[in-house]
Interface confidence: medium
């Protein structure tokens, strides 16, 4: 799994006129990470585990950068023409990454009213637009919009880029949170089912980081991918992970399942509780 | 309308250095950038790199980063590309392919092709 | 770098018959490209984005697929459509293509 940042504003505007805040939200490694709270006009680590990312360090630097980005939004959403009455919305969710192996990739993706029209590769500089005549339209008032302003030229879209992916290595780098190894806590649990069937679940909860392995076997044989249900891992609000994978068994023979887990090089079998 | 015409077939000793040509011709040629594609007789397609012809900037297939020089003179609209130590493996048509801004822009436009022959 | 495998490598297929070549990448990519060639010329855009069909190309194309796996669709095989075709990313660099796959017809 790469590293990741991922940053998602929003800009709304009410009969043509573009509103004074913005919603913003930061994801790390695709943990809820920062927000921007509008009464303090200030970014807030989301919970214990964000604030340890920095340790006592503030979030001034965080705050600057989430300000500059909502007022360039702001300014994008005033030159989209088709602003009718009521309530509109501008999305920008930006993301860069770094692999395994130390490449980087980044991207940037506009929505209004919740709908994609926009997408910018920002290593390649390419765009690319939904085929819907509604978002070829935005899109091309956004970009005459985005060229025309000196800010954003190419350069700005890589320096965007560059400091995305510096803020996220001062995130790894400084971080002892993110390089930790947290084991996972597994519960195996069974439900009846019909005709003498049972489902068994395996839970793995509080792991970081992401990758796991979860798998139902058969006297030590793993199970057919298409015999089992697995859960998606998904954070679960403490910069920790959650997944499950569940099959069904026939009663009686609960004894011959084991669930298989293999985590940062370490692995375990849980049997099912009779 | 857009055209990309490429300089004509080489014969080179290995050892020697070729440089080729792209003439771009029926748009802006500093508003896009322009990339270099290899292909070998009866093989595949290889991106080799690309050079922005408004600043000069260039982007390099590690693989080819060595023996490969992208280079282009505005004022006359050519994008060049130097080969230099050559062998045999670098007998092959080499294409320049256009670069693009929206998605249906890139790789629309493609030269007619260098046909480079290696040979003692 | 990403490393794309299309399959086959070469296949025929009667005019009238369904034709689906498949492309896999060794990473998730956001979209893939397709490229026809014929012999003695340069490769054509074909598909771009996944899905969108470049100018000029029959409505019997569609391309398809997310992640790691893609592919290129013709609904009914006609005799123009024999070529090599090719998969594209430029999901990061270097931009790779896929091997290709030389359609026959019979």
């Known amino acids: 799994e790469p590293h990741s940042l991922r940053y998602n504003l929003t800009v709304l505007s009410w009969d043509g006129s573009v509103q004074s805040g913005f919603l913003a939200e930061v994801h790390l490694d695709g943990q809820p990470f920062l927000r921007y709270d509008r009464q303090k006009c200030r970014a807030k680590p989301q919970g214990q585990w964000a604030e340890d990312v920095l340790g006592n360090k503030t979030w001034d630097r965080e705050t600057r950068d989430l300000t500059g980005n909502g007022k360039d939004l702001r300014m994008t959403l005033a030159h989209i023409k088709d602003q009718k009455e009521g309530l509109h919305s501008l999305q920008e969710i930006r993301v860069c990454e770094i692999h395994e192996d130390n490449s980087t990739r980044s991207s940037q993706h506009f929505y209004y009213d919740g709908e994609l029209f926009l997408s910018q590769n920002v290593e390649t500089e390419e765009w690319t637009v939904p085929q819907s005549s509604r978002a070829q339209t935005l899109a091309m008032n956004v970009r005459n919009f985005l060229k025309e302003d000196a800010m954003k030229t190419k350069t700005h879209y890589h320096a965007m880029h560059a400091d995305c992916l510096q803020e996220l290595r001062r995130y790894l780098e400084s971080s002892v949170v993110l390089r930790r190894r947290v084991p996972p806590m597994v519960n195996v649990t069974r439900s009846e089912a019909s005709e003498g069937n049972i489902t068994v679940t395996c839970r793995a909860s509080s792991f970081y980081p992401r990758n796991i392995t979860l798998t139902w076997r058969q006297d030590g044989v793993s199970l057919s991918h298409d015999t089992q249900q697995w859960g998606d891992v998904l954070p679960d609000g403490n910069g920790t992970y959650q997944t499950w994978v569940a099959t069904r068994i026939c009663q009686g023979e609960e004894q011959r399942f084991t669930c298989y887990m293999e985590h940062s090089g370490n692995h375990s079998t849980h049997p099912v509780p009779s | 309308q857009v055209q990309l015409q490429q300089s004509a077939a080489e014969l080179a000793r290995p050892g020697a250095s070729v440089k080729m040509s792209c003439k771009a011709s029926?748009?802006?040629?500093?508003?896009?950038?322009m990339h270099w594609v290899k292909q070998r007789p009866g093989q595949g397609l290889e991106w080799i790199g690309y050079?922005?012809?408004?600043?000069?900037?260039?982007e390099y297939n590690q693989k080819f980063k060595d023996k490969t020089t992208l280079t282009v003179d505005k004022s006359s609209t050519t994008s060049y590309m130097q080969l230099s130590s050559l062998t045999s493996d670098n007998s092959a048509v080499y294409y320049c392919?256009?670069?693009?801004?929206?998605?249906?822009?890139?790789?629309?436009?493609w030269g007619q092709g260098t046909l480079v022959t290696v040979s003692a | 770098q990403i490393v794309l495998t299309q399959s086959p490598a070469i296949m025929s297929a009667s005019p009238g018959e369904k034709v689906t070549i498949t492309c896999s990448a060794s990473?998730?990519?956001?979209?893939m490209h397709w490229f026809q060639q014929k012999p003695g010329t340069s490769p054509k855009l074909w598909i771009y984005?996944?899905?969108k069909l470049a100018s000029g190309v029959p409505a019997r194309f569609s391309g398809s697929g997310s992640g790691t796996s893609h592919s290129l669709t013709i609904s009914r095989m006609e005799a123009e459509d024999a070529a090599t075709y090719y998969c594209?990313?430029?999901?990061?660099?270097?931009?790779?293509f896929g091997s290709g796959t030389k359609l026959e017809i019979k």
């Open positions: 392919a256009r670069g693009g801004d929206w998605d249906v822009d890139w790789f629309v436009y």
């Open positions: 029926g748009y802006t040629f500093t508003s896009y950038t």
């Open positions: 050079i922005n012809p408004s600043s000069g900037y260039t």
């Open positions: 990473s998730s990519i956001s979209y």
């Open positions: 984005s996944t899905s």
């Open positions: 594209q990313h430029r999901s990061t660099y270097p931009f790779t």
